[in-house]
């Protein structure tokens, strides 16, 4: 059979091989598309409701004056000339849509380096068969799955077209010390050979890169944390971070009630003051980080306090960027 | 310290073409990209398009796309803006800009003292 | 193309007064920037990703907002916060920058 792609809507002319170039003529044309059962025969004489979606011509060729995706399938001519020599036609129909150039939309215009972000999703809308997307990084194809790239489409299909609308997300993981301004496109490549790629514009997100907050300092007085009843203990956290970040406390894991401040004094301690303390620096452009915690003890008259405090782990580090 | 060195006055006829310059220093020129932005007189700020040094790629707000074509010279740290097809229009203060990307986010993070642009026959 | 509108177009504030700047934009962008400019000289980097202080701003200045809507406040308004006050935002879908139309602040 021959391959035939047409495009949907145009019209289509199939020759019918061997016929009299014109009546009279013994040929006729079978059919076996989306809008047959099994085999339609269609001769010379047409008629009927068939003329509008396909008629026999004159010459024996048959004319479909707007191909739908319908008629897809195999069209077959069996024709007898004067002679009585019998000749066969055989066509494979396959139809195709080119859609409008693609389309990002919901482009991020920054992105963060090192986290996950979205950058923006492709659309392309009215294509047959589907065809797919693919994503382009300063020109070159990003591979989904790989390096921090991941990519969540979806196929729609319009329920009276018939034809396909394609959405794809991409989701990239900046790499630290990376371009600064990386070009994404996205590209439509059809679904049948032959016909070439429709691009988007590029987009252009800014990338930074927060910086990695100092680690916070939490300087207790008395060095140790260990005081005698009633005494007082200065808990002072220390942030190198410009600008300076809200200081929040917390008393065995859980946040102390407290306006933020970057000191916070027990006075006249009590039982109810032992615990280990914290404080949690929080930048507007990063998230929270933790300092060292410290054990805060009251210590008996006659007692040794310890040497150099009862120090707990290293906190929580970050909890989470931007 | 990052400076951007721009000349102060550039008085130029109708319907004639002016190159602005803008020479940086205090930083690895090619690691940034540069901008360009109009302020006519007593107005607000429009911005003109942006340079990456380093490989000379351009965005160019689509209004002046005809009228500014931008350039770098490496060698001498230097951005450059043509402007054509003067008129009245074009009478304005031109200022370069550096790109603040990095550890600070800001769009526009130095901005040179900006030439002022008369166009008068 | 996304417009930024800024109001109002011209204000006065008396010193010690609360001051709240506005730029709205015609469709959601992610984050804003503003820059202050006094007369003569170039503008400069105030406020960016719509709520962090550039270098050496005053802490009483604040930015905050999302989507359409945004603002910079004054907490306590002084003689020498008296400038012009321009909102900027990115769209990277093509590249371009766009700046409101600016807010003229005098001292009263």
């Known amino acids: 059979a021959q391959n035939i792609t047409a495009r949907i809507g145009e019209p289509l002319v199939l020759k019918c091989k061997g016929a009299p170039k014109k009546p009279p003529q013994r040929l006729e044309w079978k059919l076996n598309t989306g809008r047959t059962e099994a085999w339609k025969v269609l001769s010379p004489q047409g008629g009927g409701p068939w003329d509008s979606v396909a008629r026999v011509l004159p010459n024996g060729s048959l004319f479909l004056p707007a191909v739908g995706i319908q008629d897809e399938g195999i069209f077959r001519c069996q024709a007898m000339n004067r002679n009585g020599k019998e000749t066969k036609s055989n066509y494979r129909v396959r139809v195709y849509q080119i859609p409008g150039k693609p389309e990002i939309v919901d482009s991020a215009s920054e992105l963060t380096a090192g986290v996950p972000n979205k950058v923006g999703t492709c659309v392309s809308e009215g294509s047959y068969p589907a065809g797919t997307l693919s994503w382009h990084l300063d020109g070159k194809p990003l591979v989904p799955n790989e390096k921090g790239v991941s990519v969540k489409e979806q196929t729609r299909r319009h329920p009276e077209t018939g034809l396909f609308t394609l959405q794809s997300e991409l989701m990239v993981t900046p790499a630290r010390g990376g371009d600064p301004r990386p070009t994404f496109s996205c590209s439509f490549s059809p679904g049948l050979p032959r016909h070439r790629a429709l691009r988007t514009a590029p987009i252009q997100p800014r990338v930074w890169e927060p910086v990695p907050l100092e680690e916070v300092q939490l300087v207790v007085e008395p060095e140790g944390g260990a005081v005698a009843p009633g005494g007082t203990v200065t808990l002072t956290c220390e942030v190198p971070a410009q600008p300076s970040p809200q200081i929040h406390w917390m008393k065995d894991g859980v946040p102390l009630p407290l306006p933020p401040s970057p000191v916070l004094i027990l006075p006249e301690i009590g039982p109810q003051d032992q615990g280990t303390y914290s404080c949690v620096a929080t930048h507007s452009s990063h998230g929270p980080q933790e300092s060292r915690a410290v054990s805060i003890s009251i210590i008996e008259p006659g007692e040794e306090g310890p040497t150099a405090g009862s120090v707990g782990g290293s906190g929580l580090g970050t909890l989470a960027l931007a | 310290q990052v400076q951007l060195q721009q000349p102060g006055a550039e008085l130029v006829k109708p319907g004639a073409s002016v190159r602005l310059s803008c020479k940086a220093s205090?930083?690895?020129?090619?690691?940034?990209?540069m901008h360009w932005v109009k302020q006519r007189p007593g107005q607000g700020l429009e911005w003109i398009g942006e340079?990456?040094?380093?490989?000379?790629?351009?965005n160019y707000n689509e209004k002046f796309k005809s009228k500014a074509t931008l350039t770098v010279d490496k060698s001498s740290s230097t951005a450059y803006m043509q402007l054509s097809s003067l008129t009245s229009e074009d009478s304005a203060v031109y200022y370069c800009?550096?790109?603040?990307?990095?550890?600070?986010?800001?769009?526009?993070?130095?901005w040179g003292q900006g030439t002022s642009v008369t166009v008068s026959s | 193309q996304i417009v930024l509108t800024q109001s109002p177009a011209i204000m006065s504030a008396s010193p010690g007064e609360k001051v709240t700047i506005s730029c709205s934009a015609s469709?959601?962008?992610?984050?804003m920037y503003w820059y202050q400019q006094k007369p003569g000289s170039s503008p400069k980097p105030w406020i960016y990703?719509?709520?962090n202080l550039a270098s050496g701003v005053p802490a009483r200045f604040s930015g905050s907002g999302s989507g359409t809507s945004y603002s910079l406040t004054i907490s306590s308004m002084e003689a020498e916060d008296a400038a012009t006050y321009y909102c900027?935002?990115?769209?990277?879908?093509?590249?371009?920058?766009?700046f409101g139309g600016g807010t003229k602040l005098e001292i009263k």
């Open positions: 800009a550096r790109d603040g990307l990095g550890y600070r986010p800001i769009a526009m993070d130095y």
């Open positions: 205090g930083y690895t020129f090619t690691s940034y990209w």
């Open positions: 340079i990456n040094p380093s490989n000379g790629r351009t």
């Open positions: 469709s959601s962008v992610s984050y």
């Open positions: 990703r719509t709520s």
């Open positions: 900027q935002q990115y769209h990277s879908y093509p590249p371009m920058y766009t």
